[in-house]
Every structure is written in C-alpha cells, then in structure tokens.
C-alpha cells in the first residue's frame, strides 16, 4: 500500500504566440481545481477508461478575476497535494490524466458551473520511494508544471511497496531467512502475510493480504472444494478428465465495485473494499457532495447536499459512469459491418472498411469496384477487369487523392494562358479568342461565333472553367 502524490506548481499560458484568453473575467470570476486519474501499466491514456489505480480531486483554488486587458498570467492554485492512495503494489509504470477545471462563480442559476479547461496525459515509469519527478505538459496554449512521486505506507517498502518491514527484534540480525530492509537497515523484512484465515494447505499468496487458491479449491480463503460430481454447476464445466475443477464466472468477475473498489468473494455473494471517500454495497456512494463538482464532461449534479446523501450525475450524450467519467464506447456495439474496423473519434464514429466494401458503416458491397472508394468526390468505374476512379475536377491519381494540375493537359486553345485555380482552371485568351477554353474566335466586327460573352465580360478576359 502507498500514496501517489501530485504537486501542481503552475498552470498558465505556454510559451510562444497565441496566448490563451484568461478563463475568468470581472463579470465571471472563477477558480480552478484539478483532477488526477491514474491507471496501471503503459495503458492507453484515454479519458474514458476507468482510473483503476485511483483518482483524486483537489480543493478549489483562490477566486480569480481577470484584470481587463492583461494577458492571462499563471492562475492561482489550490493549496496542498493531490493524493491518490493505492492498496496493492505500486505498478512501476503508470498512465496519468490531469484535468484542469474551471468553476465559474457568477450568478448561474442552480449554482456554480464547471467546465474543463485543459487535459494533459502521459505514461511514465516511476519507482516508489524515489525522489519527486518534475514534469511540464502542454494542452493547447496552456502549460501545466507539476511534480509527482509514489511513496509506500509503513510497513510496506521497496520500489513496488510489496515488501514489509518490521523493527528488528534482536539488535544484531534478522530472523531466519529474512533480510535487512534496505534502506532501513535497522529494520527486517517481514514474512509475507497472506489474508487472515487463508488455508495453509490449499491457498498461497504472492502479495500481502492476498489468498490465491490451488487447483480444486475455491472461496475467499480457499477452503471450499470445487465440485467434481457434476459439470452442471453454475460455476461452469471444465475438461472431461478433471471434472469441474476450473471455476467459471464468480461474483467478483467483472468487478462489481465502483470507484476503484476491490472485490472479495464471500460464501454467499461478494464484498467491496472501498477507497477513501466512497462507501455503499458497490462503493457507489461518495462522501463528495455536488459542491465538490464531482460530475465530469459537462455532467449535471443533482442532490447530495450533505455528505451522507448521494449525489447523482446526469451525463451528457456520449458519457456514462457515476461521475460521467467514462466515454460511451460506441464501437462496442460493432457498428462497422463486413469486417470493418471501428474508430470512436468522440465527435463521430468512423469505420475503416475492408477491400470490397464501402459506406459509412462498410455496408455497401462494392463488387463491381471491388472495395475501391474514390476520394474527394470521385466515382468508381469498372472496366476490363480493372477499376479506376473518375475524379472530380481538381483531383487525380488512382484514388483521386492527388491534387491534379488542371493545366497539365494544356486546355486553353489558340495560345491562351492557363492558370490553376482552387475551383478548376482559368484561361486567359489571346487577342481574338474567347470562351472558357479560348475555343471561339471573335469576329472582326465584334460578334462571336457563339453566344456573346456574358454582360460585363470583354472578349479576351480570363474565363473561369468550372
């Protein structure tokens, strides 16, 4: 067990041009607060995945009012550290998200309004017990400077907080098989203590407080033999040779405990051990109130006027979770057909199609054009066993991805000069010719061989070919 500590040093405009506008004004004073979310391993730092290592919310910073005309300075910060306690081993590699939130203190109906100012994310390696690590992250025009460290809570020590130390019982040496606890040489490594009551015959542990069962045994303390009499038990069948030794889904599968709670099986059901600040059967009730601004991503907080009554976050579309902290994984609905791969871009879904299919959801079987979509408004044409793209004006190449040079084919007749234009080409005709491609001679008496130039356009003026 231990604590991850985050110290915010400054939040303000980053270097370079384009300084951001101050988030507060005389009409709308505001104050900042921060949220940190930690995940184990070098996982994706997507904001929507749960903060499996824990999360913390800072206190509110001092109220700030912008001085008119002044550039945004470093904004006043909340006091103190953000602390994220962790119960188990420190993973050594972790991903973080640090969000800077603005609380507007104007005359909003229904209390203060919260909005996300900046979100930074990263992946780091960090040994517990080491010195403070300094970091600078940029989010748009904003810059966040901070330090962080992980420290073990006694009696845990080591880079992962998995070794336990106890004061020496004898002044000279540690007990049999136990080493001195570097760097605390006056202490000794304690033997690994499994969960209280863990069966010494059928259970074992690799980390303190854990109880893992040998094959054939189950239950929180590995005291319950797995049934071998029938493969119809609700815990699921195994191979014919071993009967039903491998447990199927248990009450803790999928972790029913919310907000970083850890689950342990009980004889009849499960039990959640909740992190600080949460309680309830599934750690769903929080000591946090709506005044703490617990709803993220624009969620609306309702109820929870005092710490004993739960608040509810009403999430905007695209977000879910007790704090609106999870983005709805719209790709889990498998909207892309025919083997297409799904991307949730936040503002939209995109399907990457396999050859042979196209369309927003890869729903069109392009047998004629065999999986070839043409870019930039081009259309697919089949012929002679091969496809080609008939490209819209201004584009060329195999998929119409290349900007064509409309003048390459020398489209202007009779010595006219060609100019590329964003919408096509323009021909500047030589004296005596007119038309979109300078194809019509102007008769000496001023009449043209085809309809006269539009009003206001003199023969010989550049004509745009669209």
């Amino acid at each position: 067990a231990g604590v991850f500590e985050l110290q915010i040093h400054s939040f303000g405009p980053g270097p370079g041009p384009g300084a951001p506008r101050s988030p507060c004004s005389a009409r709308l004073p505001c104050r900042l607060f921060f949220r940190v979310c930690l995940k184990p391993g070098l996982s994706e730092e997507a904001a929507e995945s749960p903060c499996a290592l824990g999360a913390a919310l800072s206190a509110r910073g001092p109220v700030y009012t912008e001085q008119p005309g002044a550039p945004a300075p470093d904004l006043p910060l909340p006091d103190g550290l953000l602390q994220v306690p962790f119960r188990d081993a420190w993973p050594g590699t972790f991903s973080f998200i640090i969000e800077t939130w603005r609380e507007e203190l104007g005359d909003q109906i229904g209390g203060p309004a919260w909005s996300l100012l900046a979100r930074v994310a990263g992946r780091r390696r960090l040994a517990a017990g080491g010195p403070w690590a300094r970091d600078i992250q940029r989010a748009g025009a904003w810059e966040l400077r901070f330090s962080y460290r992980a420290r073990c809570e006694p009696p845990a020590v080591g880079t992962a907080c998995t070794r336990l130390c106890r004061p020496r019982s004898a002044p000279s040496r540690c007990g049999p098989g136990l080493r001195p606890c570097a760097p605390l040489e006056d202490e000794c490594e304690a033997p690994l203590v499994c969960r209280a009551g863990c069966s010494p015959e059928h259970g074992f542990c690799e980390q303190p407080g854990e109880c893992r069962c040998l094959e054939g045994w189950t239950g929180p303390l590995c005291t319950v033999p797995v049934s071998t009499s029938s493969c119809l038990s609700p815990r699921g069948p195994s191979s014919a040779t071993t009967g039903c030794l491998v447990p199927g889904p248990g009450p803790c599968d999928g972790n029913p405990c919310a907000n970083g709670g850890s689950c342990s099986e009980t004889p009849r059901s499960f039990e959640c051990t909740c992190p600080r600040g949460f309680y309830g059967l599934r750690c769903e009730v929080s000591g946090v109130t709506c005044a703490d601004g617990p709803c993220f991503n624009g969620g609306l907080c309702v109820g929870g006027a005092d710490p004993d009554s739960a608040y509810i976050c009403h999430c905007p579309p695209g977000f879910q979770g007790s704090n609106c902290e999870k983005r709805v994984d719209r790709c889990s609905l498998q909207p892309c057909r025919n083997g297409g791969l799904c991307l949730d871009l936040g503002h939209a879904l995109r399907c990457r199609c396999r050859a042979g299919f196209a369309g927003p959801r890869c729903e069109h079987d392009l047998d004629d054009c065999a999986g070839r979509a043409c870019a930039n408004g081009g259309t697919c044409v089949e012929g002679g066993g091969a496809h080609r793209c008939s490209c819209a004006l201004g584009f060329g190449g195999r998929d119409c991805r290349e900007r064509a040079d409309p003048c390459a084919a020398r489209p202007c007749a009779h010595g006219g000069r060609c100019y590329a234009h964003f919408s096509g080409l323009v021909c500047a005709c030589a004296p005596g010719y007119m038309g979109a491609r300078c194809e019509f001679p102007v008769h000496p008496d001023g009449a043209s061989a085809l309809p006269a130039a539009p009003p206001g356009l003199r023969p010989g003026d550049p004509q745009r070919y669209l």
Partner: antibody, heavy 120, light 111 residues
Framework: QVQLVQSGAEVKKPGASVKVSCKAS????????IHWVRQAPGQCLEWMGW????????EYASKFQGRVTITADTSANTAYMELSSLRSEDTAVYYC?????????????WGQGTLVTVSS | DVQMTQSPSSLSASVGDRVTITCKSS???????????LNWLQQKPGQAPKLLLY???KLESGVPSRFSGSGSGTDYTLTISSLQPEDFATYYC????????FGCGTKLEIK
C-alpha cells in the same frame, strides 16, 4: 503523388534497438493504416504490424509481439517502427506500406525499404 | 497463424509462355463477409513489392490483363497468359483474411 520515404540504412549491435521512420507525402497518414513488412536476405516477406494513426491503435504479428513498437507523429505525417533486443536474424530490409483509401487491408503503396544490419 | 505455401519456389520460362503459380493456405481464406482476401504481389530485385491482384481475381489499377487470379477455400492460382520480358520477377501470395501472411515466393526466371 502518394509517396513513402524511409530513413537510411542502419548497422546495430546485437541487443540494441533500431527505429526506422517512414515519411508520407501526397496523403495524410491519419486517413490510412501504415503497415511494416520485413524481408531478410533470401527469406520470405514477413508482416510485422500496423498502426491506425487516427487513434494510435496498433496490431502486431505474434512473432514480433513485445519486441516491436509502431508509432506515428501525425503532425510530421511520419510513422515509426522500433525493434528492440536485436539479433543477427533481424538483419533485413524493412518496408513501410500503406493501404488504399478506405480499404485498410490492401498494401498498395510501399516505401523504398531500409536495410538494417545486426552484427557484432 | 495461417501458413501460405507457394509452389514452385522457382520456375524457368520463355517470353510468350503461359505460366501458373499456386498458393495453398493452411485454412480457408473465406471471410465471414463473403469475400476472400488473397492478394498477389510482384517484386523485382532491389525494389519494393507491387500489388498485382486483390480479392483473388481483381486486377490492381494499371496491371496488364495478361495477369489473372483464381481459386477459393485454400487453393489459389496466379496465371500469366503470355509472358513478357518485364514479367521476370519474384511473385508472392498474401492473405489478409486472418491478419497478414505472405507466401515464400516463386522466382520466375528466363529459360
């Protein structure tokens, strides 16, 4: 036109890592998958993996899992392939390739290849 | 992992000949979407591979019609109806139904 230009040849010692770059022009790498394929002297072509630069998703061949990392810098329109714990049998020409517009599984455009030699 | 076995590994032929190269997969390449993701590529010495056919028989843009492909399930064939001097190269099959696996190539040489 669509082009993939790879970084120059590299000589590495066993146990080291190599990072090969693949700069795209004529298209935005966010629109397509970038694949990496290698060819050891006199050997078969081997697909190593791909990246979807739009969101950073990657898929690796099981043979290279844990040793290869494919990344992309969309602002530079460039993809990278890093192979670690090099051994002599990693001596090969490494190619990047990209798919066709919207069809992520076709290897249509190829880089010129980067020769990586692993020798003590 | 899917294995792709190409045969022959090398082949000598003359300009004008009709040539057939086969590729056998260790499992069916028919995707659940009804398509079969088998490609053929050509590689000349010192050059990167070039896509010739995809979806078994579809000619890539700009590829001459003397190249054709056929097959289903686990057995596939590339046919060059009348060899031209520029066709002497190494040919690879590539399946992309189950990730990506190349065959080991057939080297087509001048007799």
């Amino acid at each position: 036109q669509v082009q993939l230009v790879q970084s120059g040849a590299e000589v590495k010692k066993p146990g080291a890592s190599v990072k090969v770059s693949c700069k795209a022009s004529g298209f935005n790498i966010k629109d397509d998958y970038i694949h990496w394929v290698r060819q050891a002297p006199g050997q078969c072509l081997e697909w190593m993996g791909w990246i979807d630069s739009e969101n950073g998703d990657t898929e690796y061949a099981s043979k290279f899992q844990g040793r290869v990392t494919i990344t992309a810098d969309t602002s530079a329109n460039t993809a990278y392939m890093e192979l670690s714990s090099l051994r002599s049998e990693d001596t090969a020409v490494y190619y990047c390739a990209t798919s066709s517009y919207w069809s992520y599984d076709l290897l249509v455009y190829w880089g010129q290849g980067t020769l990586v030699t692993v020798s003590s | 992992d899917v294995q792709m076995t190409q045969s022959p590994s090398s082949l000598s032929a003359s300009v004008g000949d009709r040539v057939t190269i086969t590729c056998k997969s260790s499992q069916s390449l028919l995707h659940s979407n009804g398509k079969t993701y088998l490609n053929w590529l050509q590689q000349k010495p010192g050059q990167a591979p070039k896509l010739l056919l995809y979806l078994v028989s579809k000619l890539e843009s700009g590829v001459p019609s003397r190249f054709s492909g056929s097959g289903s399930g686990t057995d596939y064939t590339l046919t060059i109806s009348s060899l031209q001097p520029e066709d002497f190269a190494t040919y690879y099959c590539l399946q992309t139904t189950h990730l990506y696996t190349f065959g080991c190539g057939t080297k087509l040489e001048i007799k």
